[in-house]
């Protein structure tokens, strides 16, 4: 993929590690959970596919004073070698859809934790 | 503290090849980026590419696409940077740095660099 | 590529006078999602490059404020309001926006 005289290319598989972070501070975000996440924010649903991390990024950015998912985001960061910025827009997001931060970081979590089981970390 | 502890210098033939090492401490290594950049003696930085360690993807500057291949070992918090088929071009110091979600993926610490000579 | 040409190459100050080095870019370099990458680095001698600015005009943690970055689209400039002796060193501009990301030829600050 040749992007503005750039060459973007996929990594090796990673080893579980940073998968299994990630799905810790997702179970550690729903788990913790009191009043409403990040106060009911509703953010762009994603199809949960190839791309997902940089979708979930673009998602979740646009939640701002939000300390619960500060974490996440820059755990997402980490698994997108794209710079994303709030206001950004994916083709990968459900456009007509908006969820709960809550329901979305559970979705996102369940989706994880199936990979991590299949042994897809990438 | 955060640190990018780059291995020593190296001192390598023409042709060759050399894995040159960046690890990481105090900061969760998945969570950030890592830069690649390349500074020849007396002479300003060229950007080689980053690597999102998590995933372990890249985005490579196309000259060093057949030169430079940025890859992340996990488990112990090491970046590496594998140079091939070297020439006198490639004798400089190579420095790893960290991109930052938080202050907008600019480089905001530095390893302190690994000088790679090619010499007969 | 974006070329990023720096001017002046050399600059020589006395200590406690005000410093401006150019940064511009052969391109507009605002990212396909809004924002501006522009940073500002500084080496001294026989040192790795530190971080002083990002996103044109943030000043880094620790960054005194005598340090200040400006401007838009493809000219930038970095000001240095009372230079101290340990703000000599090589300047570099750099552009996070588009791939290869670039950095300046670079500006000596050094006594005059």
């Known amino acids: 993929l040749t992007c503005l005289g750039g060459f973007a290319s996929p990594g090796p598989v990673p080893p579980s590690t940073a998968l299994r972070e990630l799905i810790e501070e997702l179970v550690n975000i729903t788990q913790n959970q009191k009043a409403p996440l990040c106060n009911g924010s509703m953010v762009w649903s994603i199809n949960l596919t190839a791309g997902m991390y940089c979708a979930a990024l673009e998602s979740l950015i646009n939640v701002s004073g939000c300390s619960a998912i500060e974490k996440t985001q820059r755990m997402l960061s980490g698994f997108c070698p794209h710079k994303v910025s709030a206001g950004q827009f994916s083709s990968l997001h459900v456009r007509d859809t908006k969820i709960e931060v809550a329901q979305f970081v559970k979705d996102l979590l369940l989706h994880l934790k199936k990979l991590f089981r299949e042994g897809q970390f990438n | 503290q955060v640190q990018l502890q780059q291995s020593g210098d190296d001192l390598v033939k023409p042709g060759a090849s050399v894995k040159l090492s960046c690890k990481a401490s105090?900061?969760?290594?998945?969570?950030?980026?890592i830069n690649w950049i390349k500074q020849r003696p007396g002479q300003g930085l060229e950007w080689i590419g980053h690597?999102?360690?998590?995933?372990?993807?890249?985005y490579d500057n196309e000259m060093f696409k057949d030169k430079a291949k940025l890859t992340v070992d996990t488990s112990s918090s090491t970046a590496y940077i594998h140079l091939s088929s070297l020439s006198s071009e490639d004798s400089a110091v190579y420095f790893c740095a960290r991109g930052s979600f938080t202050f907008f993926y600019a480089m905001d610490y530095w390893g302190q660099g690994t000088s790679v000579t090619v010499s007969s | 590529d974006v070329l990023m040409t720096q001017t002046p190459l050399s600059l020589p100050v006395s200590l406690g006078d005000q410093a401006s080095i150019s940064c511009r870019s052969s391109?507009?370099?605002?990212?396909?999602?809004?924002?501006?990458?522009l940073e500002w680095y500084l080496q001294r001698p026989g040192q790795s490059p530190k971080l002083l600015i990002y996103?044109?005009?943030n000043r880094f943690s620790g960054v005194p404020d005598r340090f200040s970055g400006s401007g838009s689209g493809t000219d930038f400039t970095l000001k240095i309001s009372r230079v101290e002796a340990e703000d000599l060193g090589v300047y570099y501009c750099f552009q996070g926006s588009h791939v290869p990301y670039t950095f300046g030829g670079g500006t000596k600050l050094e006594i005059k």
């Open positions: 391109q507009n370099i605002v990212h396909s999602n809004g924002k501006t990458y």
């Open positions: 105090g900061y969760t290594f998945t969570s950030y980026w």
């Open positions: 690597i999102a360690p998590g995933s372990g993807e890249t």
């Open positions: 996103k044109v005009s």
